[in-house]
C-alpha cells in the first residue's frame, strides 16, 4: 500500500494509472466504500462523500491513462485509505494528513515560549524535528517547546514530520517582538545633550501600546518614572514627563528620547518598557548614562565620572601630547598643582577612548577656561 503524507490546508494529488493510455472508466472510493468521484465518458461525476466539494480530478490526464484524485484544503480527518478502481484492478493509497501550528500567535515577545503542536491522525506515530532560523534543532512528539525566545529566533522555522519513512515539511514564520539591543550605554560630558534611541527589531503594520522609562540615578535612593507615553499606529504621544529632567520624545518610531543636558545627578541606568496591545508581557531595553566632569578648584585639577562604569575602565588625566600624569581604575582622578596647558580627561576601555573632556589650565595668576 502506497503512503502519501499531506499538510492540513494544502492540496494533495493521489495518483492512479491504468495500463491503457486512454480514457476509460474509473472511480475513487474511501475505506468505507463510499464513492468520491469517477467518470462517465468525458464527464466527472461525484459521489456522496464528505469530500464532495473539495474533491476533483485532472481531465486533461485521462487520455493518458492517469486518473488522479485531487483533494483541496486538506483536513486531518481526510486521513484514510483511498481506493482507485480501474480496469478491474484496485490501487490503494493511504493518506495521512498532518497539521503543525504555533500555540497562540506567531508574534511573540522576547523571553516568551513558543509551543508547536502537531495534529495527526489516529493510529499514526510521527516524529517531528524543527530547525530554528539560527540553526538550532529541536525534536519531539505531539508538542515541541522552546522557552526564552531570543531575537535570533525570528524568521522561518522549518519543521519535518516523519511517518512511515515519508516526510512532510512545514514552514512557520515566527516574529520575536523585541528591541534591537537589550542594553546600550551612552557616554557624555557634563552639559552635552543626550540622545537615547530604542529601535525595534520588527516591523508590523499597526503598532499600538504604551511605554514608560524608569530611571535609577546613581545618586538617587529610589528609581523614578521619567516619562510615560502612548503608541498609536506608530505615532508617539507623551502622557506624562517628570519635572526634572525635562525629557523630550520624538513623535515617530523609532522611539527616541532627548535629555537636554547630561548632569552628574542624571547618571545611572534606565529601563524602557513597552506594553503592546493584545500581548501579555512587556518589551524591555536597558539604557545607561555615564557623565564626565573635569574641574579645576584652586590648585586641584579633578576629573570625575558618574554612572555605571565597568571596573576595567581607566580614567586618566594628561597634558595634551604628553604621557598620562595619572591613570586609575577609579571614578575620580586628580592632579595637584597642574602645569599650564590643555589637559585631557580620558575614560578608556583597553586603549579605546569612550569619553574625553578638555580643560585649559592657565598660569597660576588667572582662572581656568573650559572649552
Amino acid at each position: 500500500k502506497k503512503v502519501v503524507l499531506g499538510k492540513k490546508g494544502d492540496t494533495v494529488e493521489l495518483t492512479c494509472t491504468a495500463s491503457q493510455k486512454k480514457s476509460i472508466q474509473f472511480h475513487w472510493k474511501n475505506s468505507n466504500q463510499i464513492k468520491i468521484l469517477g467518470n462517465q465518458g468525458s464527464f466527472l461525476t461525484k459521489g456522496p462523500s464528505k469530500l464532495n466539494d473539495r474533491a476533483d480530478s485532472r481531465r486533461s490526464l485521462w487520455d493518458q491513462g492517469n486518473f488522479p484524485l485531487i483533494i483541496k484544503n486538506l483536513k486531518i480527518e481526510d486521513s484514510d485509505t483511498y481506493i482507485c478502481e480501474v480496469e478491474d484492478q484496485k490501487e490503494e493509497v493511504q493518506l495521512l494528513v498532518f497539521g503543525l501550528t504555533a500555540n497562540s500567535d506567531t508574534h511573540l515577545l522576547q523571553g516568551q515560549s513558543l509551543t508547536l503542536t502537531l495534529e495527526s491522525p489516529p493510529g499514526s506515530s510521527p516524529s517531528v524535528q524543527c530547525r530554528s532560523p539560527r540553526g538550532k534543532n529541536i525534536q519531539g512528539g505531539k508538542t515541541l517547546s522552546v522557552s526564552q525566545l531570543e531575537l535570533q529566533d525570528s524568521g522561518t522555522w522549518t519543521c519535518t514530520v516523519l511517518q512511515n519513512q515519508k516526510k512532510v515539511e512545514f514552514k512557520i514564520d515566527i516574529v520575536v517582538l523585541a528591541f534591537q539591543k537589550a542594553s546600550s550605554i551612552v557616554y557624555k560630558k557634563e552639559g552635552e545633550q543626550v540622545e537615547f534611541s530604542f529601535p525595534l527589531a520588527f516591523t508590523v503594520e499597526k503598532l499600538t501600546g504604551s511605554g514608560e522609562l524608569w530611571w535609577q540615578a546613581e545618586r538617587a535612593s529610589s528609581s523614578k518614572s521619567w516619562i510615560t507615553f502612548d503608541l498609536k499606529n506608530k505615532e508617539v504621544s507623551v502622557k506624562r514627563v517628570t519635572q526634572d529632567p525635562k525629557l523630550q520624545m520624538g513623535k515617530k518610531l523609532p522611539l527616541h528620547l532627548t535629555l537636554p543636558q547630561a548632569l552628574p545627578q542624571y547618571a545611572g541606568s534606565g529601563n524602557l518598557t513597552l506594553a503592546l496591545e493584545a500581548k501579555t508581557g512587556k518589551l524591555h531595553q536597558e539604557v545607561n548614562l555615564v557623565v564626565m566632569r573635569a574641574t579645576q578648584l584652586q590648585k586641584n585639577l579633578t576629573c570625575e565620572v558618574w554612572g555605571p562604569t565597568s571596573p576595567k575602565l581607566m580614567l586618566s588625566l594628561k597634558l595634551e601630547n604628553k604621557e598620562a600624569k595619572v591613570s586609575k581604575r577609579e571614578k575620580a582622578v586628580w592632579v595637584l598643582n597642574p602645569e599650564a596647558g590643555m589637559w585631557q580627561c580620558l575614560l578608556s576601555d583597553s586603549g579605546q577612548v569612550l569619553l574625553e573632556s578638555n580643560i585649559k589650565v592657565l598660569p597660576t595668576w588667572s582662572t581656568p577656561v573650559q572649552p
Epitope: A220, S221, K224, Q243, D244
Partner: antibody, heavy 119, light 107 residues
Framework: QVQLVESGGGVVQPGRSLRLSCTAS????????IHWVRQAPGKGLEWVTI????????YYADSVKGRFAISRDNSKNTLYLQMNSLRAEDTAVYYC????????????WGQGTLVTVSS | AIQMTQSPSSLSASVGDRVTITCRAS??????LGWYQQKPGKAPNLLIY???NLQSGVPSRFSGSGSGTDFTLTISSLQPEDFATYYC?????????FGQGTKVEIK
C-alpha cells in the same frame, strides 16, 4: 495601592533597645529608598534616616547617629529601624515614608507607631 | 546639616483668606524643597514638590514659589479643611531637615 505599615512600637526603658518594622505592599519595594521620620508628642516632624533601594547607602540625622541602624530585607518587603541606647527624647510616633514615582517628595506614609521611652 | 527656618510658627485666619508661609534655608538648596500638610493624628501629606510643583490630587489653591534659600507656600483662599500644620522639607542634602512647622488656626 501603595501601603506602608509600621509595627514594633511600645514602652521601653531608657538605655534599652527596640526594633521597628515597616512592611510594604502595592509596589516594587526593591526599587525604592525608604525613610523614617518621627514626631515627638505635640512637636514638629523630624527626619531620622534613609536607606537606599539596594541597601548600599544609609544616612542618619545627627541626633540618632551611632545609636540607630536602618536595614531592609527586600525578599520580605520589610524595612527595619534598630534603636539602641534609647533616650527620653526619642519618644515619638515613628513613620516610614516612600518617595513619589515622579519626584523626590515623600508621597506615601505609614500610619505611624508610637515609641515611648520612660522609666 | 542644613537648617530650615519656617515662619510664622502659627497664624490665625478666616475662611477665604489668602495665607502665606515662608521657609528659609541656611544655604542654597536650589529648588529642592517640598511642602507638607499634617492634620492631628494623621500622617503628613505632600502638597508641593520641587518648590513650585503641585502634587497630583492637591487643590490648585495651594502654590509654592522660591529658589535658592527663600521659599513660600501660598493658600489663595483658605478652606475649612485647610486648618492644619504645614512643614517644609529640604531634599537637597542628607540629613534631610524639616522646618519647625506653621499651625494655621481658625480666627
Amino acid at each position: 495601592q501603595v501601603q506602608l505599615v509600621e509595627s514594633g512600637g511600645g514602652v521601653v526603658q531608657p538605655g534599652r533597645s527596640l526594633r521597628l518594622s515597616c512592611t510594604a505592599s502595592g509596589f516594587n519595594f526593591i526599587n525604592y529608598g525608604i525613610h523614617w521620620v518621627r514626631q515627638a508628642p505635640g512637636k514638629g516632624l523630624e527626619w531620622v534616616t534613609i536607606i537606599w533601594y539596594d541597601g548600599s547607602k544609609k544616612y542618619y540625622a545627627d541626633s540618632v547617629k551611632g545609636r540607630f541602624a536602618i536595614s531592609r530585607d527586600n525578599s520580605k518587603n520589610t524595612l527595619y529601624l534598630q534603636m539602641n541606647s534609647l533616650r527620653a527624647e526619642d519618644t515619638a510616633v515613628y513613620y516610614c515614608a516612600r518617595e513619589d514615582d515622579w519626584n523626590d517628595g515623600l508621597a506615601y506614609w505609614g500610619q505611624g507607631t508610637l515609641v515611648t521611652v520612660s522609666s | 546639616a542644613i537648617q530650615m527656618t519656617q515662619s510664622p510658627s502659627s497664624l490665625s485666619a478666616s475662611v477665604g483668606d489668602r495665607v502665606t508661609i515662608t521657609c528659609r534655608a541656611s544655604q542654597d538648596i536650589r529648588n529642592d524643597l517640598g511642602w507638607y500638610q499634617q492634620k492631628p493624628g494623621k500622617a503628613p501629606n505632600l502638597l508641593i514638590y520641587a518648590a513650585s510643583n503641585l502634587q497630583s490630587g492637591v487643590p490648585s489653591r495651594f502654590s509654592g514659589s522660591g529658589s535658592g534659600t527663600d521659599f513660600t507656600l501660598t493658600i489663595s483662599s483658605l478652606q475649612p479643611e485647610d486648618f492644619a500644620t504645614y512643614y517644609c522639607l529640604q531634599d537637597s542634602n542628607y540629613p534631610r531637615t524639616f522646618g519647625q512647622g506653621t499651625k494655621v488656626e481658625i480666627k
